[in-house]
């Protein structure tokens, strides 16, 4: 019971934060930029992934896709595909982690299959967690540093430099949303992962003699055994794993100098 | 290559009128923002009037009821005209487009400036 709680917790939990990757993604607030100095054109800037956007103080708000990428930061490139393999990730997980399921049942799915399943899609979800808390820290890093404060062009006719409206960038609405469903995608990852150990069949092998005492004859067979103690889980003698050894039930006893004394 | 010339600065007497032309080439004059801004002699540089994409038209608190920004689209060209103007007028005046969509780094471009003069 506990463990299908935890998987289907960790199941909900991750499919929460790869939403919230994937509105992080798409977001257009990941920096915005306060143009506080500007007492004519009093306009707030922000920035996205894929486009830019500008609002007015009236209401009015425009946005426009990125023109090219070779005017791009590399920095942003990398955080682009740092989110989207976090989302290719995650969706992969999540898909695989409805047939883990324990409350699912699909055709005589064994209990091992699910395990190795959740385990699959724990490791995914993981993953895909610190790719998007990766992408949202290399992003932020960037704003932490003012990597573009001083690229805009501007002359005078004496030819020295004007100093434009001064911009101030901080962390935009998309940081925040990206690292908490980085976060709970990760401990979704993680509730996943023990739950995966909960569902793995517990099975006790053993190396010893395989016997039985009907009458006077014993049937002795060299190598890996298991032993048979007739209660337990291994009460049909069924074979657990094939060590050059057979259950009693298969071993023929054959006439040898020790059967007769 | 993105250029601002304007044109139309010289010398007036106070109380007279003076209109300022910005051509663009290279850049929409319909641009997220378009601004007038101007330095006086051996002063900082002070923002005069300024007309944003959305239509938004801002001027400063010194030229309200005495300054126009307007722009021409057909002719991507912004003025300012001037009327009763003073002896404080006196300033470089340059042209400013500043554009944030479309583009990761904001950019700020800048004519070379005209001269106006207001003296007796």
């Known amino acids: 019971m506990a463990v299908t709680a935890c998987q289907g917790l960790g199941f909900v939990v991750s499919l929460i934060g790869i939403a919230g990757i994937i509105a992080a993604t798409c977001m257009d607030q990941w920096s915005t930029q306060d143009l506080y100095n500007n007492p004519v054109t009093a306009v707030f800037n922000y920035q996205g992934l894929w486009r830019s956007c500008v609002r007015e103080s009236s209401g009015f708000t425009e946005c426009r896709g990125y023109f090219t990428l070779l005017g791009l930061p590399a920095m942003l490139q990398a955080v682009r595909a740092l989110m989207i393999v976090g989302i290719v990730l995650g969706a992969i997980g999540l898909l695989v982690s409805i047939f883990a399921l324990k409350c699912i049942r699909i055709g005589s799915m064994e209990d091992s299959a699910k395990a190795n399943m959740t385990l699959t899609s724990g490791i995914m979800f993981i993953v895909s967690g610190l790719c998007a808390i990766a992408g949202v820290s290399v992003f932020a890093n960037m704003l932490v540093t003012n990597f573009w404060m001083s690229t805009a062009n501007m002359y005078t006719g004496m030819g020295g430099m004007v100093q434009t409206v001064q911009t101030r960038y901080t962390f935009g609405a998309a940081l925040f949303v990206g690292w908490v469903a980085g976060g709970l995608t990760l401990i979704g990852g993680v509730m996943m992962c023990i739950a995966c150990r909960g569902l793995a069949p517990e099975e006790t092998n053993y190396k010893a003699v395989s016997y039985h005492a009907s009458g006077h004859s014993v049937a002795y067979k060299p190598g890996g055994f298991k032993a048979s103690t007739g209660f337990g889980s291994n009460t049909k003698n069924k074979k657990i794993y094939d060590g050059g050894a057979r259950t009693e039930d298969e071993v023929q006893s054959y006439p040898s100098k020790h059967d007769y004394v | 290559q993105v250029q601002l010339v304007e044109s139309g600065g010289g010398l007036v007497q106070p109380g007279g009128s003076l209109r300022l032309s910005c051509a663009a080439s290279?850049?929409?004059?319909?641009?997220?923002?378009m601004a007038w801004v101007r330095q006086a002699p051996g002063k900082g540089l002070e923002w005069v009037s300024g007309?944003?994409?959305?239509?938004?038209?801002n001027y400063a608190d010194s030229v309200k009821g005495r300054f126009t920004i307007s722009r021409d689209n057909s002719k991507n060209t912004l003025y300012l005209q001037m009327n009763s103007l003073r002896a404080e007028d006196t300033a470089v005046y340059y042209c400013?487009?500043?554009?944030?969509?479309?583009?990761?780094?904001?950019?700020?471009?800048w004519g070379q400036g005209t001269l106006v003069t207001v003296s007796s």
């Open positions: 290279g850049v929409d004059i319909s641009s997220d923002v």
């Open positions: 007309l944003t994409r959305g239509g938004s038209i």
């Open positions: 400013n487009a500043e554009i944030y969509t479309g583009t990761f780094y904001p950019r700020s471009y």
